[in-house]
Interface confidence: medium
């Protein structure tokens, strides 16, 4: 005979665990149904009645199967200088990210408390290490034979073009200038860019019995003037 399928609530066999999407209620001492993402437990189960679930209210969510008595609040509204990359729904938290060209400089579990502009490398300096969602750009002086003529958080030092006859030698901040005869080799026109960091951090981890992989949201602090770009004094 096939084994009977137990309907929640039911008492588990000694030493066994409840099934997927069920939880053991200590008070009722029964296996009971969890609530689906977007819902929460309105009434906990008893020995004779299963969990009663209800939808999360506006601005609240649950991301996992759960039996929490109330849904989690979505994080603070994104500031005007942030980008909302994921809206608050009944099943997911809002995700705010620092705007392009900025990175998170001061974070807490709730997310980023301070977004700061990525450092710009001045002419004569190129990007040695690109910015990430949590670290600033590192600039380095252009080595002999290379140059950068831009103020940029993405441009690296590029080789000078090779001339048959040099009109003006290149330096750290300027390409070589060739005489009217075409150069032997030159870089493709335009600067070489490094990719911008992409921030994909979401807001709060969810305190439920199942592990949550939700990372944390970026909040933006209104900033004063940007810090000076690195490179003019070589510091």
């Amino acid at each position: 005979l096939p084994a009977q399928v137990a309907f929640t609530p039911y008492a588990p066999e000694p030493g066994s665990t409840c099934r997927l999407r069920e939880y053991y209620d200590q008070t009722a001492q029964m296996c009971c149904s969890k609530c689906s993402p977007g819902q929460h437990a309105k009434v906990f189960c008893t020995k004779t009645s299963d969990t009663v679930c209800d939808s999360c209210e506006d601005s609240t969510y649950t991301q996992l199967w759960n039996w929490v008595p109330e849904c989690l609040s979505c994080g603070s509204r994104c500031s005007s200088d942030q980008v909302e990359t994921q809206a608050c729904t009944r099943e997911q938290n809002r995700i705010c990210t620092c705007r392009p060209g900025w990175y998170c400089a001061l974070s807490k579990q709730e997310g980023c408390r301070l977004c700061a502009p990525l450092r710009k490398c001045r002419p004569g300096f190129g990007v040695a290490r690109p910015g990430t969602e949590t670290s600033d750009v590192v600039c380095k002086p252009c080595a002999p034979g290379t140059f950068s003529n831009t103020t940029s958080s993405t441009d690296i030092c590029r080789p000078h073009q090779i001339c048959n006859v040099v009109a003006i030698p290149g330096n750290a901040s300027m390409d070589a200038v060739c005489t009217s005869t075409s150069p032997t080799r030159s870089m493709a026109p335009g600067a070489v860019h490094l990719p911008q960091p992409v921030s994909t951090r979401s807001q709060h981890t969810q305190p439920t019995p199942e592990p949550s992989t939700a990372p944390s949201t970026s909040f933006l602090l209104p900033m004063g003037p940007s810090p000076p770009a690195e490179g003019s004094t070589g510091d």
Epitope: S76, R113, A116, L220
Partner: antibody, heavy 120, light 111 residues
Framework: QVQLVQSGAEVKKPGASVKVSCKAS????????IDWVRQATGQGLEWIGE????????YYNEKFKGRATLTANKSISTAYMELSSLRSEDTAVYFC?????????????WGQGTLVTVSS | DIVMTQSPDSLAVSLGERATINCRAS??????????MHWYQQKPGQPPKLLIY???NLESGVPDRFSGSGARTDFTLTISSLQAEDVAVYYC?????????FGQGTKVEIK
């Protein structure tokens, strides 16, 4: 306008616990941190910890870890600070304060304070 | 923990004169061009009141005779022209990292 209203004065015996409440109004309670700071008579300010009511996440000064418990009830916009195993040196005024998640990152509105006296 | 040290402990200044309070942090409280240093005023029997946030920003409703300056580890609160209602204890505080810490306070009185 933002207001934080704290519960009344308490007198406790050494070893007991005290729970101070802080009711917030005038802003979205779940959007900002509630910090707790204490001040012994004639002394300076000492940070106990903070809670983010939106998620229940807490941050404690190591000095108070294990003795202080910060909680929040979102439905009534009220934060709580419970301090256990009280000793005479815990006699102080306890303040709650709001700290915005982003913006000032400072405590811009404070409760009126709650005097907790620990005496046998 | 970041230790905040204020100087002087007390200060007596004539009405209309300048009052200057210093605060030194045991390590930098700066991050990406922002100083996470704040100044509070506390009068007897009252909670502290935020005067200056992030080193130099005047809190709404605070008279502009109050100003803040400094970066990294050294900060100053200045009252350009002391008024009778400015008699209070002033505290600096850092919020760069947990635990947030306060200076020991500077008492300002009328000379």
């Amino acid at each position: 306008q933002v207001q934080l209203v704290q519960s009344g004065a308490e007198v406790k015996k050494p070893g007991a616990s005290v729970k101070v409440s802080c009711k917030a109004s005038g802003y979205t309670f779940t959007d900002d941190y509630i910090d707790w700071v204490r001040q012994a008579t004639g002394q300076g300010l000492e940070w106990i910890g903070e809670i983010y009511p939106g998620s229940g996440n807490t941050y404690y000064n190591e000095k108070f870890k294990g003795r202080a418990t910060l909680t929040a009830n979102k439905s009534i916009s009220t934060a709580y600070m419970e301090l256990s195993s009280l000793r005479s040196e815990d006699t102080a005024v306890y303040f709650c304060a709001r700290s915005q998640v982003y913006g000032k990152i400072a405590m811009d509105h404070w409760g009126q304070g709650t005097l907790v006296t620990v005496s046998s | 923990d970041i230790v905040m040290t204020q100087s002087p402990d007390s200060l007596a200044v004539s009405l209309g004169e300048r009052a200057t309070i210093n605060c030194r942090a045991s390590e930098s409280v700066d991050n990406s061009g922002n100083s996470f240093m704040h100044w509070y005023q506390q009068k007897p029997g009252q909670p502290p009141k935020l005067l200056i946030y992030r080193a130099s920003n005047l809190e709404s409703g605070v008279p502009d005779r109050f100003s803040g300056s400094g970066a990294r580890t050294d900060f100053t609160l200045t009252i350009s022209s002391l008024q009778a209602e400015d008699v209070a204890v002033y505290y600096c505080q850092q919020s760069k990292e947990d635990p947030y810490t306060f200076g020991q306070g500077t008492k300002v009185e009328i000379k």
